[in-house]
Amino acid sequence: FAPIPRITWEHREVRLVQFHEPDIYNYSALLLSEDKDTLYIGAREAVFAVNALNISEKQHEVYWKVSEDKKAKCAEKGKSKQTECLNYIRVLQPLSATSLYVCGTNAFQPACDHLNLTSFKFLGKNEDGKGRCPFDPAHSYTSVMVDGELYSGTSYNFLGSEPIISRNSSHSPLRTEYAIPWLNEPSFVFADVIRKSPDSPDGEDDRVYFFFTEVSVEYEFVFRVLIPRIARVCKGDQGGLRTLQKKWTSFLKARLICSRPDSSLVFNVLRDVFVLRSPGLKVPVFYALFTPQLNNVGLSAVCAYNLSIAEEVFSHGKYMQSATVEQSHTKWVRYNGPVPKPRPGACIDSEARAANYTSSLNLPDKTLQFVKDHPLMDDSVTPIDNRPRLIKKDVNYTQIVVDRTQALDGTVYDVMFVSTDRGALHKAISLEHAVHIIEETQLFQDFEPVQTLLLSSKKGRRFVYAGSNSGVVQAPLAFCGKHGTCEDCVLARDPYCAWSPPTATCVALYQTESPSRGLVQEMSGDASVCPDKSKGSYRQHFFKHGGTAELKCSQKSNLARVFWKFQNGVLKAESPKYGLMGRKNLLIFNLSEGDSGVYQCLSEERVKNKTVFQVVAKHVLEVKVVPKPVVAPTLSVVQTEGSRIATKVLVASTQGSSPPTPAVQATSSGAITLPPKPVPTSTSCEPKIVINTVPQLHSEKTMYLKSSDNR
């Protein structure tokens, strides 16, 4: 299983941009217009246009509410007036440069309309959305607009019992056959068009792929077995002349396999799919997100597939056929017989045209009848390397987007951004046959499921957008700037981040226009490439005899083990003298003069069979008797951001050029106030930094009082 994320960013720790409108929910349809830098958001009863670079900036809004009459009729059918009998936007697709095609559940009477992007008003077409959009907001759906025609997968009736994959077209509308071998209680996940290259030698057609999970027809168990499927139709399909009239003649489906070769663990419920297109990729790669059917332990997996493998299955694979055993029991077996020519389900290519099959309308009946009877392939689509890219325990992933990026050394990484049902986003890469989860970001404070993920691919403007029930969040692809040291930057093993020695900052490569010369990045995590730290920094503290000291160690890595050294000896945190707070900060009880000295917080992290040791913090502690006037016994204390309680903080300057600025000041009433401007602090948020290689114990002291002191 994949390790835990190396770093966890809490919602408050990182800069996230949010969009939500009062009383508007279910922000589940997202559409990005890269050229306009606009993100379109389809929610319940509303569509918004926001600035894609800063989604908190709303540009336009339009509401599409359900009339009271419609609501009442819907409620009469036993549906909830407050939730179900509303208009959930389910289709948000580009129709032209100036309009969007929008469909909503419309109180169980699905409707579609055109949204004019100039006026941001609906044209009032009120088209019947049956077959394009579900009746029930709880039912699955997917759609893709291809050359002005909407291809959708959804349910065709009020009950949601009739599944359909259709093309909404004025000249050639097509749909699936309503038959169990074609679609058996599918849960639609994703659809996309795969264009054939114009110089394709076989004059091939564009294909539209559909991804769904359905009830298996080929496997028999006591319970209903779910199977993930990839299906495809040809864009040029016009249906059959007699057989399969106004039905797909090119609909074929195959099983998607995502399992570990060495275990019986099968991931058979498809959650989401992302098609990765990249200039370096001849054939697109699609990433699919799965969970097992019986998922009581919270398992999720990601498998990657070459589209060429899927196409090979459809073009040359064997078919499955059904046979009725006994009265109503159907068994599925491999069809070994001669397959009609032209091949059933094949797109019309130059070879077919040469044989005078210029359109699906003049395909021979035997070919059409065969594909009608055999929509299911016997061959399965297997993942790249025959194994999942990622398997994670104790998490339910919901959505995936993938970005292909190049590290400084030229290595190409597919960065997986995977959202969870608790509002988090994981960023993961494959590193030498292992998975590295770079970070976890809490996108939504309320831990609500992420319903939609979208990736912007515009150079220099790289964001992930996440939609949930309560709103949309915009996050950058990386939080490089949060890595305060070269070691942190390198150990992050984030292909987007590199250390810039001149500025002593961790920078995002996709934001740097300048050449990458001089930047430090080591995807192996070898921090020895970092420039030598000629100066060591330490924090100097003064504590009262008999009190308790808390020494901070802000190590963000969840993969690191923190330990403390005192006068070069490792401290045992379990002893009565010491304790660990939050697995990192050191507590020293019952302070005495013998506790004075240098304390070092070190982290130990396994990186690629190597153990990396890092000095995270150095503290110089001196235990003395505190003069009485410093603190009144009734001192009321407040907690500073660094969880340290202080009455006076002085920042020691080695140059001594300017007087120290107090970070926390004691007022006459004994309350503590923060200054208007924060004092520069180290990565561990400690207010006192002394920069020197040798501790100077006689420099100005900073006095700290813990609440357990002087009582």
Partner: antibody
């Protein structure tokens, strides 16, 4: 007009081999499948196997696996059936036929093979 | 292999009479195919995929069935229908034929 023209009758000795031909006209054999079917005197029909001349893929009925060899030559639009180690049990009329999901649609006139000393 | 059993093996019918020939499969098949053969001739395709009449077959013929039970029916027997009829499946290897039903005219 679609036609399958089969080679003439054969009288062969036991233990010998024979190669029957089936030449197609009116269509290209690459666009179809050629099957061979055996019919012993006054008996029923037995399927021997088929070939896809487009790619040379062949399937045999298990009881003809050692007996029959099906080949095709697309340049002459001809399919062949070779029978080896002949015995009196192999005395029969052998038909070539085209067939796929519509069944065996076109049949040759048949070739009588007599195995006798 | 799937064994097909035809019944009856031999039957005779008067002109105008309705005739039904049955074909039973030991295990289920998707479709049944029927062929007509007259003495000294090659078999002719008669019914394909259970119920579709081959080109040139008179409309008095029909085919039906599913699973393991199939039949060929002549609504009104005519003299030219006297022949041997074979059923055949295309389901799994080997593609077997029934033993044949010899239909004679009374």
């Amino acid at each position: 007009e679609v036609q399958l023209q089969q080679s003439g009758a054969e009288l062969v000795r036991p233990g010998a081999s024979v190669k029957l031909s089936c030449t197609a006209s009116g269509f290209n054999i690459k666009d179809d499948y050629i099957h061979w079917v055996k019919q012993r005197p006054e008996q029923g029909l037995e399927w021997i196997g088929w070939i896809d001349p487009a790619n040379g893929h062949i399937e045999y009925a298990s009881n003809f696996q050692a007996k029959a060899t099906i080949t095709a030559d697309t340049s002459s639009n001809t399919a062949y059936l070779q029978l080896s180690s002949l015995t009196s049990e192999d005395t029969a009329v052998y038909y070539c036929t085209t067939g796929d999901y519509d069944g065996f649609t076109y049949w040759g006139q048949g070739t009588l093979v007599t195995v006798s000393t | 292999q799937i064994v097909l059993t035809q019944s009856p093996a031999i039957m005779s019918a008067s002109p105008g009479e309705k005739v039904t020939i049955s074909c039973s499969a030991r295990s289920s098949v998707s479709y049944m195919y029927w062929y007509q053969q007259k003495p000294g001739s090659s078999p002719k395709p008669w019914i394909y995929r259970t119920s579709n009449l081959a080109s040139g077959v008179p409309a008095r013929f029909s085919g039906s069935g599913s699973g393991t039970s199939y039949s060929l029916t002549i609504s009104s027997m005519e003299a030219e229908d006297a022949a041997t009829y074979y059923c055949q499946h295309y389901h799994t290897y080997p593609y077997t034929f029934g033993g044949g039903t010899k239909l004679e005219i009374k």
